[in-house]
């Protein structure tokens, strides 16, 4: 049986059940290389409390559909008096990056995971030439996830004192220049994740090979190498390589630009101080507030919730968007869709789509950006579920009793962007984490 998601095959992936202190290793095409789980384990569970290992999915006992992968085992489990077998179930959804498997829940018999990934899309529009896993768990099993830094088109400019060269990078995947209208970036070779431009020439100085690594809990490392043979004439016989070290800052701060810290014989060392390198619980909440010692800040957007069936309305040319954030009030136009953001076509108001659901909510504060994300909306033709990204800005003089109002700023590939100026986005900082 052919591997259902070949682009995910090259790596062993990790997921964590934080509540029970369990680490899962997952290899969807072969077996994980963990002796304690046996030679054919595709999903290996490591219980850190009891220091035991169990195979909860066998690579030989795999069944797959386009959106579901199940690994059975021969181990019996007793659930409500019936004789079941232990199994793992991975539900796949279309995403814009390779993404990460997320542990959902476990019963006595079934371990459930969900994975939003380009590999599950109906169309190839989000697929990279080359992409590597862009997250890691530290020794305390806390997740560090750089997926939000991945650019689907374009690149980041590395801060470098050399006026004659420009070094462009992407994070965990190659640079897509197809949308570029003709700048220096356009000359970058396909597949490169680190592109050096000198004059009118562009050179591949690194492609992603291995996934993100953790060196300390506040430092993550990504390495790019130039795969193809043939040395560049300005590298003194050395093969180019790029090392990007992502550093979690010691206290809350605005984002910084990636900086070139060392350069020798086409070996480039880059340091990027960014809160995305911090563990995810420091940056994110499933509710509409971020507070407490863990987050170093106090943010509470719950006063923005609308009651009594009213919604915020944002005009988007062809569409009207109805928003009801930080609550579970149904938007009348999007009846029964559990939508936090509802898209209605102006020319045909019967065309209604959920652009993100209220139970699929993430509040993120990172690098000075406060963002509320609603995902899991109605599918687009690519298979990607519509989502909305609301960028909040502090405005102590916002109208509407300080609440302000959301402004639609655009759509890219079924992701809808809004900005929202409100006094409730004014962040109160605590001290060190």
């Amino acid at each position: 049986q052919a591997a259902p998601f070949p682009e995910l095959c090259s790596y062993t992936w990790e997921a964590v059940d934080t509540k029970n202190n369990v680490l899962y290793k997952i290899n969807i095409c072969g077996s994980v290389d963990i002796v304690q789980c046996g030679p054919s384990s595709a999903v290996c569970m490591h219980d850190l409390k009891t220091r035991t290992y169990h195979s909860v999915g066998d690579s030989v006992l795999r069944s797959a559909t386009r959106s579901l992968l199940e690994f059975n085992t021969t181990v019996s489990c007793d659930q409500q008096g019936t004789n079941h077998r232990v199994q793992s179930s991975i539900a796949f959804l279309c995403g814009k990056t390779l993404g990460t498997p997320e542990f959902v829940t476990a019963t006595e018999c079934v371990h459930y995971f969900e994975w939003r990934t380009t590999a599950a899309c109906k169309k190839d529009i989000f697929k990279a030439n080359k992409e590597v896993p862009c997250y890691v768990f530290d020794e305390e099993l806390r997740k560090h996830d750089l997926n939000p830094l991945i650019k689907l088109s374009g690149a980041y400019l590395v801060d470098d004192s050399d006026p004659d060269t420009s070094l462009f990078i992407n994070v965990c995947r190659d640079i897509d220049t197809l949308r570029d209208p003709g700048s220096q970036l356009r000359a970058c070779p396909p597949g490169t994740a680190a592109c050096l431009v000198r004059g009118h020439q562009a050179f591949d100085v690194g492609q992603p090979r291995d996934g993100l690594k953790v060196v300390r809990k506040d430092r993550l490392v990504l390495s790019y190498v130039r795969e193809e043979a043939g040395k560049l004439d300005f590298c003194d016989g050395h093969s180019p390589a790029v090392t990007i070290t992502f550093v979690c800052p010691s206290e809350r701060r605005e984002g910084t630009i990636p900086k070139l810290t060392a350069k020798s014989n086409c070996r480039y060392e880059i340091e990027w101080i960014t809160e995305y390198a911090c563990h995810r619980d420091y940056l994110e909440s499933k509710t509409c507030s971020l507070s407490g010692e863990q987050q170093d800040v106090s943010i509470d957007l719950t006063p923005l919730a609308q009651s009594g069936g009213s919604s915020y309305i944002s005009d988007g040319k062809e569409y009207l968007f109805y928003l009801n954030v930080c609550g579970e009030t149904e938007i009348q136009f999007c009846n029964k869709k559990q939508a936090a953001v509802c898209q209605v076509k102006k020319s045909d108001t019967s065309q209604v789509k959920a652009a993100g659901r209220y139970h699929n909510q993430t509040l993120r504060y990172s690098d000075g950006d406060l963002t509320l994300i609603y995902f899991g909306g109605d599918e687009c033709s690519s298979g990607f579920q519509r989502m909305s990204v609301i960028n909040f800005r502090c405005n102590k003089t916002a109208g509407n009793d300080g609440k302000g109002t959301p402004v639609f700023t655009g759509e890219v590939d079924c992701t809808y962007f809004f900005t929202w100026d409100t006094e409730y986005a004014c962040v109160h900082h605590h001290h060190h984490h």
């Epitope: 690149a155 420009s166 462009f168 949308r179 570029d180 970036l185 960028n391 655009g410």
Partner: nanobody
Framework: QVQLQESGGGLVQAGGSLRLSCEAS????????WGWFRQAPGKEREFVAA????????SYADSVKGRFTISRDNAKNTIYLQMNSLKPEDTAVYYC????????????????WGQGTQVTVSS
């Protein structure tokens, strides 16, 4: 390819104000970072201000901080540069440009350019 068309330039006295507009058409407005640049006679093109498309974060050249404001109206596919407290040294042709590179103020990283609009500040 994005097509850009600037307007709003003109002759103004020192201390006065102007608002430049740049209308974009063609390929998706939303995937770009937008910048304003200027070029005075006999000088190189220099960065004035930029706005990131995803978060609307802005950056400015030191020489215009506190006087100029970049903004955008996505409904109209238009970028603006509000220029207050103008000085004679602000005299230049002002260009609007689009880039898919983050964190850049380098004109060579901007691939689409308008034709420019002349701003003259008299003393």
């Amino acid at each position: 390819q994005v097509q850009l068309q600037e307007s709003g330039g003109g002759l103004v006295q020192a201390g006065g104000s102007l608002r430049l507009s740049c209308e974009a058409s063609g390929r998706t407005f939303n995937t770009y970072n937008w910048g304003w640049f200027r070029q005075a006679p006999g000088k190189e093109r220099e960065f004035v201000a930029a706005i990131r498309w995803s978060s609307s974060k802005t950056s400015y050249a030191d020489s215009v901080k506190g006087r100029f404001t970049i903004s955008r109206d996505n409904a109209k596919n238009t970028i603006y540069l509000q220029m207050n407290s103008l000085k004679p040294e602000d005299t230049a042709v002002y260009y609007c440009a689009a880039s898919i590179v983050d964190f850049t103020t380098n004109p060579s990283h901007f691939g689409s350019w308008g034709q420019g609009t002349q701003v003259t500040v008299s003393s």
